[in-house]
Interface confidence: low
């Protein structure tokens, strides 16, 4: 059996492709025949599903070549709060102990996750006798769970988060140390394994793998909301907005922003991924009677999608009788 391929590198040249290059093994142990390239979509870290990105106006940004996602706090908080209830210049409220703790956890998590991806090494599955006829389980990164009591984290189960292991796909590469993997999802992390195979491959199998993690580029328009925004009137001067989610987003949709208003001014409402998953839309409450327009924008791991076309809705004024009852 040959030794593992060397110096595996991967880069993305589009939202659906990864270019992989490597060098031949140092010990071919015979005639090198071909390579087996296997790739596997990696699950998003569970934290991304559970974190409420509406809570502290945190947006994810891509910082690392290995595809890790970092969280950055927006310094100018769009939902500026007035301190002490007095009118006047806005200021940042002093951080509570809980917020300081959450920030500490955040920094800790960031460091741990970054180190995890930088230091990932292939752990071969336990030694098994060739004689054992048993199922070969695919090796994968396990989804990391993060215990936290912070209020900005949901404890609900996202169906996508349960999908912690995706299948491996595989191709054979003859006589070259380079391949292009296609039909991948945009802005998604993949693990790519390369095995060297020599003339004894059919009998003895191929080498253990050398592997690399790589993320595809974001796709233009992938985070755009694909269909019309609809609305339904609700009691108590409220309405419910519904919209379809992007089918193949850049990694993961983290939140939606609704920009709505009458002729006077625009209001903004943030809808977390978890809320959207639960209700399929969002309720706008305490609206004054009148005509409104609303537009919605999705935010994914790679940034913002386009704003939808405006949807027009109205809130009826209550009749005198209704006012008397209320």
């Amino acid at each position: 059996v040959p030794s593992i391929p060397l110096d595996v590198l991967s880069a993305s040249n589009s939202s659906s492709q990864l270019i992989v290059k490597w060098n031949p093994p140092s010990l071919p142990n015979g005639n090198l025949s071909y390579y087996i390239v296997r790739w596997q979509r990696q699950p998003q870290d569970g934290y991304l599903y559970r974190h409420n990105y509406c809570s502290k106006d945190k947006i994810p940004i891509r910082k690392y070549a290995d595809g890790t996602i970092d969280i950055e706090e927006v310094t100018e908080n769009p939902k500026t709060e007035v301190c002490g209830g007095e009118k006047g210049p806005c200021c940042a409220c002093p951080k509570t102990e809980a917020e300081k703790q959450a920030e500490k956890e955040e920094a800790e998590y960031r460091k741990v996750f970054e180190n995890f991806l930088h230091n990932s090494i292939f752990v071969p599955r336990p030694e098994r006798k060739r004689r054992d006829v048993m199922q070969v389980a695919n090796t994968t990164m396990s989804s990391r769970s993060r215990n936290t009591t912070a209020a900005d984290t949901y404890n609900i189960t996202d169906p996508e988060e349960l999908e912690t292991e995706y299948p491996f796909f595989e191709s054979r590469v003859d006589n070259k140390e380079r391949t292009v993997i296609s039909n991948l999802r945009p802005f998604t992390l993949y693990r790519i394994d390369i095995h060297s195979c020599n003339h004894e491959a059919e009998k003895l199998g191929c080498s253990a793998s050398n592997f690399v993690f790589a993320r595809t580029m974001p796709a233009e328009g992938a985070d755009d909301i694909p269909g019309p925004v609809t609305w339904e009137p609700r009691p108590e001067n409220s309405i419910f907005l519904k919209w379809p989610e992007p089918e193949n987003p850049n990694g993961l949709i983290l939140m939606y922003e609704i920009k709505y208003g009458s002729q006077v001014e625009d209001q903004r409402e943030c809808v977390s991924r978890q809320e959207y998953r639960k209700y399929g839309g969002a309720k706008l409450n305490r609206l004054n009677p009148g005509n409104y327009t609303a537009r919605i924008q999705a935010t994914s791991l790679s940034g913002n999608g386009s704003w939808t076309d405006p949807v027009f809705f109205y809130v009826q004024a209550k009749t005198g009788y209704e006012n008397f009852i209320h």
Epitope: I36, V37, R38, R125, R130, R131, D132, V133, M134, Q135, V136, A137, N138, T139, P167, F168, F169, E170, S171, R172, D193, H195, C197, H199, E200, A201, E202, K203, G205, C206, S207, A208, S209
Partner: antibody, heavy 127, light 110 residues
């Protein structure tokens, strides 16, 4: 229960096409390489084709090369054999077979033999 | 003509030991593992021996396989009437890049 169920056989004229399917159940289909094997009436077994667990690698017997295509859909747990330019000598019962556990890289090792077979589907090529 | 050579027929009486041979070349049996398959009349083949001499679970230990050089053999001891079947050897052929079967041996229990 581990099971393979072939379908799609039938009578076809020389030069015609047919697509065989093999539905797998009772095991993790995407972890195993698969094969098609045929048996002409009153004759022995003849290996036709092999496909790796991920579908990226394929091999064919010389007698069918360029005419038959093996493929798989791991999301549907189904193996396929597309047969074009059929000849009278392709008349046979076609079996799909699962290979025993492979090495982690899922190359074409037959060390473990074909450990599960379907019941077969008859393909008759005649005018 | 099959790449692997087997005797077309073999026979024995109940309780007897019968051996079926399978002869190949350096590109198949000589460098790869051999499997044996049993095909009872009117049924699909069944794996009997893999990796030259290993029995899958459920196969009685009356069946044993061995390999030496470019030949392999299947031995059936304590022959029973239900062993009457066709037996095939198989191996990967590295030069043909194909799996090859023997022509099959029809075993009759007298």
């Amino acid at each position: 229960e581990v099971q393979l169920l072939e379908s799609g056989g039938g009578l076809v004229q020389p030069g015609g096409s047919l697509r065989l399917s093999c539905a797998a159940s009772g095991f993790t289909f995407s972890n195993y390489a698969m094969s098609w094997v045929r048996q002409a009436p009153g004759k022995g077994l003849e290996w036709v084709s092999w496909i790796s667990s991920g579908g990226g690698s394929t091999y064919y017997a010389d007698s069918v090369k360029g005419r038959f295509t093996i493929s798989r859909d791991n999301s549907k747990n189904t193996l396929y054999l597309q047969m074009n330019s059929l000849r009278a000598e392709d008349t046979a019962v076609y079996y799909c077979a699962k290979l025993g556990s492979l090495f982690p890289n899922a190359t074409a090792s037959y060390a473990y033999g074909m450990d599960v077979w379907g019941q077969g589907t008859l393909v008759t090529v005649s005018s | 003509q099959s790449v692997l050579t087997q005797p077309p027929s073999a026979s024995g009486t109940p309780g007897q030991r019968v051996t079926i041979s399978c002869s190949g070349s350096s590109s198949n049996i000589g460098s790869n593992d051999v499997s044996w398959y049993q095909q009872l009349p009117g049924t699909a083949p069944k794996l009997l021996i893999y990796d030259n001499s290993q029995r899958p679970s459920g196969v009685p230990d009356r069946f044993s396989g061995s390999k030496s050089g470019t030949s392999a053999s299947l031995a059936i001891s304590g022959l029973r009437s239900e062993d009457e079947a066709d037996y095939y050897c198989g191996s990967w052929d590295a030069s043909l890049n194909a799996y090859v079967f023997g022509g099959g041996t029809k075993l009759t229990v007298l």
